[in-house]
């Protein structure tokens, strides 16, 4: 059994998240993950989910009673999601920590926008432009 | 030329982001994107970058002078990054809008944690477990 399982059960107790009523009004993440089978689509969604958990854990960083559980789970996320590559994790953390209200950050983001956009679609790297990328479908 | 280019140039003027000093102290996004060649790694990073721009644009939604530019760019992001798939975009937006301080959201997130973790690595879906996923490297 992966180390995170026991620690996640510990967090369930702490957050009182084991009760059946927690599942009322649908899921946060599981339903969305079910929709996406392709690896690149899943990474788009999981990227947001992992950053949510990191933010959540940060909010409870001073609570000693769950520190071991949180650290174990974060460590396992590093292994599973970032394939144990610290550089990947560091780049990810940099992106999540940029402040959208910082004027210098805003200027830089707008300065880089054209180049970021040019790289957004896989087609941009191969020189192909798929017909599916010419219309915003419902 | 893609429609976003002209509108991004317009935003550069608005944010005073065309000056050479904007590039001082390195890039926000471009240096990070340069590090990652594999599509799934790029999606992890681009997911955070796109959500940053959406947040930034939201902060300026009441500024009429740049509304057309913002809408055009957002539209082109939908085309390029979400491959014009509205469901993909909607699921993404749901994830970015969850509040990390909402107690019900916290409880749900912890309730789903074990299942989310089980799905994080590509290995989880194929039943293989790579040796590389056993240690968090530097």
């Amino acid at each position: 059994q992966d180390p995170y399982v026991k620690e996640a059960e510990n967090l369930k107790k702490y957050f009182n998240a084991g009760h059946s009523d927690v599942a009322d009004n649908g899921t946060l993440f599981l339903g969305i993950l079910k929709n996406w089978k392709e690896e690149s689509d899943r990474k788009i969604m999981q990227s947001q989910i992992v950053s949510f958990y990191f933010k959540l854990f940060k909010n409870f960083k001073d609570d000693q009673s769950i520190q071991k559980s949180v650290e174990t789970i974060k460590e396992d996320m590093n292994v599973k999601f970032f394939n144990s590559n610290k550089k990947k994790r560091d780049d990810f953390e940099k992106l999540t920590n940029y402040s959208v209200t910082d004027l210098n950050v805003q200027r830089k983001a707008i300065h880089e926008l054209i180049q970021v956009m040019a790289e957004l679609s896989p087609a941009a790297k191969t020189g192909k432009r798929k017909r599916s990328q010419m219309l915003f479908r419902g | 030329q893609d429609p976003y280019v002209k509108e991004a140039e317009n935003l550069k003027k608005y944010f005073n982001a065309g000056h050479s000093d904007v590039a001082d102290n390195g890039t926000l996004f471009l240096g990070i994107l340069k590090n990652w060649k594999e599509e799934s790694d790029r999606k992890i990073m681009q997911s955070q970058i796109v959500s940053f721009y959406f947040k930034l644009f939201k902060n300026f939604k009441d500024d009429q002078s740049i509304q057309k530019s913002v809408e055009t760019i957002k539209e082109d992001m939908n085309v390029k990054f979400f491959n014009s798939n509205k469901k993909k975009r909607d699921d993404f937006e749901k994830l970015t809008n969850y509040s990390v301080t909402d107690l019900n959201v916290q409880r749900k997130a912890i309730h789903e944690l074990i299942q989310v973790m089980a799905e994080l690595s590509p290995a989880a879906k194929t039943g293989k477990r790579k040796r590389s996923q056993m240690l968090f490297r530097g």
Epitope: S84, K87 | D41, F136
Partner: antibody, heavy 120, light 111 residues
Amino acid sequence: EVQLLESGGGLVQPGGSLRLSCAASGFTFSSYAMSWVRQAPGKGLEWVSAISGSGGSTYYADSVKGRFTISRDNSKNTLYLQMNSLRAEDTAVYYCAKDGWNALGWLESWGRGTLVTVSS
Amino acid sequence: NFMLTQPHSVSESPGRTITISCTRSGGSIGSYYVQWYQQRPGTAPTTVIYDDKKRPSGVPDRFSGSIDSSSNSASLTISGLKTEDEADYYCQSYDSNNLVVFGGGTKVTVL
């Protein structure tokens, strides 16, 4: 201050065995991955093996896989390398190194090394 | 697996600047951190650069590290060369199979 002290080196015949130890102090031993790196006389550095902080995960260079076993005793703050079926090409100074995180990558601190000579 | 290739030797006069390259074959240089170690004769290696370009405390700012994606290589630059910089320098990185790899080493001679 981090201190790493290797011991257990010496002269051994081809096919023989040797067990190296590395006594660690000055840091929380169980929180860091540890590695063994070797250097043959007049040659460059070669990574040999690594182990996670808990000891649950171990890694080996292809050249030693199946012959060497890395282990640790966190209660004694000690790292080990059991070397079996030794060959002449295993002759080297063996360094114990503390990784910069509970992670392979940056070998932050090194011991002084212990010399292993495999010869008949 | 991948390899890291360094020049065998570099020599320069005191006060000058040298750059040692470390070219990665297999995988992207930017996707994994690169470290640089200094090893003086008869002593254990010590870190001069980690995480591509960070310096441990005590390492002078004459030492700097960089990454160049276009050539898939890392570089160690030593400016204001001093006689005490004479040593072997090794680059080191890793890959997704949990293999740590060192470059072959570069002997730096201060003329």
